[in-house]
Interface confidence: medium
Amino acid sequence: HKCDITLQEIIKTLNSLTEQKTLCTELTVTDIFAASKNTTEKETFCRAATVLRQFYSHHEKDTRCLGATAQQFHRHKQLIRFLKRLDRNLWGLAGLNSCPVKEANQSTLENFLERLKTIMREKYSKCSS
């Protein structure tokens, strides 16, 4: 069957996000992928969205992330916009109202996004074949 247009949008956004480092992509987030064996796909998407929302809510106005130059400021604002878009699309794909995020493990935002991109690409390859 055809792949969800939302999935394509997510992959596109993740490609943009992982292309460029910013001052805050090395900051850590909860690693929901570390122990996700008994988690459904929808729960994974929901929890990923929750982690992203926590990140951008906390760091959107973070002076360390905004940087010292207009270019750094621009990159950070771009990062936040992409994270918000990703969050919105993941919620749409998950179709769940809320989900707990209790993991102790941490990973950098950069690695988190790379892992999420791999999962999304795998899902896309399955639904497009």
């Epitope: 207009a70 400021f73 621009h74 604002k77 771009q78 916009r81």
Partner: nanobody, 116 residues
Framework: EVQLLESGGGLVQPGGSLRLSCAAS????????MSWVRQAPGKGLEWVSE????????YYADSVKGRFTISRDNSKNTLYLQMNSLRAEDTAVYYC?????????WGQGTLVTVSS
């Protein structure tokens, strides 16, 4: 061509007030979330305040909350920052910027100096 032109900066004594303006042109102003950002001498950029496209919701950095007020007049394509109870640490170049869409535009900035 997009233009953002700040004005209203200057020298003011501690405790004084200033009103900054930012005249916008070249884009659909009332579609854009707008921000004020400042840069103190030798320091990094500091986000100051943000206002939604319709002017309904405003956000402020803790350092200016209760002293600064952001507003906009969409009929005049102008963004404002009313600054009261100014302190020496508010000395900086103040920039207005579009920060809500997939692009960012900046003005040239206006210098605010708070000194006795």
């Amino acid at each position: 061509e997009v233009q953002l032109l700040e004005s209203g900066g200057g020298l003011v004594q501690p405790g004084g007030s200033l009103r900054l303006s930012c005249a916008a042109s070249g884009f659909t102003f009332d579609d854009e979330m707008m921000s004020w950002v400042r840069q103190a001498p030798g320091k990094g950029l500091e986000w100051v305040s943000e206002i939604t496209a319709g002017g309904v919701i405003t956000y402020y950095a803790d350092s200016v909350k209760g002293r600064f007020t952001i507003s906009r007049d969409n009929s005049k394509n102008t963004l404002y920052l009313q600054m009261n109870s100014l302190r020496a640490e508010d000395t900086a170049v103040y920039y207005c910027a579009t920060t809500g869409s997939d692009f960012d535009y900046w003005g040239q900035g206006t210098l605010v100096t708070v000194s006795s």
